[in-house]
Amino acid sequence: CDLPQTHSLGSRRTLMLLAQMRRISLFSCLKDRHDFGFPQEEFGNQFQKAETIPVLHEMIQQIFNLFSTKDSSAAWDETLLDKFYTELYQQLNDLEACVIQGVGVTETPLMKEDSILAVRKYFQRITLYLKEKKYSPCAWEVVRAEIMRSFSLSTNLQESLRSKE
């Protein structure tokens, strides 16, 4: 399955929207910095596109879940958030189209399940952090920056896979 060119453009638009969503300077939130344990190795160890698709799908699904809570709606600009949802939704559709073509997710191998669980654990730590910080503006800014970083890393993986094939 070849992900359409629009998928790459969508990823870039997603990053751009995340950047535009910034409301306060991260420098004013240095005391709130936190390591969420992004499982980077799960995005670097897979050499087959078929193996990465379920992991990328989980990553985008969890970003969608994180930003579609009522706490998130209160933290961000509604117009930007709506555009952000649209981009993520399109990317999920692209990845699911690959699944339907028989690549990846429906029969996830056990080793891929472990990668998916690593991604879930990472997002659970993010949600725990937000709860602990009572969804403060600084906490959301730390999370926004973290998602930009981790999404960018996973996007880079997609690009490197495309260039290999």
């Epitope: 390591d35 499982p39 654990k121």
Partner: antibody, heavy 122, light 107 residues
């Protein structure tokens, strides 16, 4: 096959230190939380603490914080529970458990070790 | 802490019977309810997760339902293996907590 294999029973005197172990196999060690659960003989279950083996990030039950500590050795896929000074009230069976996380990030304990009996008596 | 209260604390039944155990949480835990069975001298084992999902390998005679502050575990057509202690658990809030247990024995 997922396995959590715990060390054998321990008999200790009050004030002694102890470390019990849980060796895991059959899955990617760093992908799942591990918790310890206490069961006082004839009583119910109490969740104590959980750890992310990837970087040893921990969350404690406040009832146990400061009295026990959890740690991991990634090189041998083993999780530990440690006491620096045991009390008679620590007499219990201790289970290590693996967490599964659903897509909506609900934790549940899908695999349990066989348990380690710790008896503290003078 | 979220308190989990099981009822009854014990019950007697015969092979082939159906039984229902109820668990109440002191505040809403959504569907973050789970059920475990513990046979004498053994570690607990997962039966039902997220209130109503049957764990792989668990017989379909076990069913879970409910959400919010109350959930139930129903066992139909009791088998000799089912005489054990049952625990509910919530993982909605820290610390995670269990019910006090329901001991199911042979009438």
């Amino acid at each position: 096959e997922v396995q959590l294999v715990q060390a054998g029973a321990e008999v200790k005197a009050p004030g002694e230190s102890l470390r019990i172990s849980c060796k895991v196999s059959g899955y990617t060690f760093t992908s799942y939380w591990i918790s310890w659960v206490r069961q006082i003989p004839g009583k119910g279950l109490e969740w104590m603490v959980k750890i992310d083996p990837r970087d040893s990030y921990t969350i404690y039950n406040p009832s146990f914080q400061g009295h026990v500590s959890i740690s991991v050795d990634k090189s041998i896929t083993t999780v530990y529970l440690q006491w620096s000074s045991l009390q008679a009230s620590d007499t219990a069976i201790y289970y290590c458990v693996r967490h599964y996380l659903t897509q909506s990030l609900v934790d549940y304990f899908d695999h349990w070790g066989q348990g380690t009996l710790v008896a503290v008596s003078s | 802490d979220i308190q989990m209260t099981q009822s009854p604390s014990s019950l007697s039944a015969s092979v082939g019977d159906s039984v229902t155990i109820t668990c109440r949480a002191s505040q809403s835990v959504s569907n973050y309810f789970h059920w475990y069975r513990q046979k004498p001298g053994k570690a607990p084992e997962l039966l039902i997760y997220s209130a109503s999902n049957l764990q792989t390998g668990v017989p379909s005679r076990f069913t879970g339902s409910g959400s919010g502050t109350e959930c139930t575990l129903t066992i139909t057509s009791l088998q000799p293996d089912d005489f054990a202690t049952y625990y509910c658990q919530q993982t909605h809030g820290y610390p995670f907590t269990f019910g006090q247990g329901t001991k199911l024995d042979v009438r």
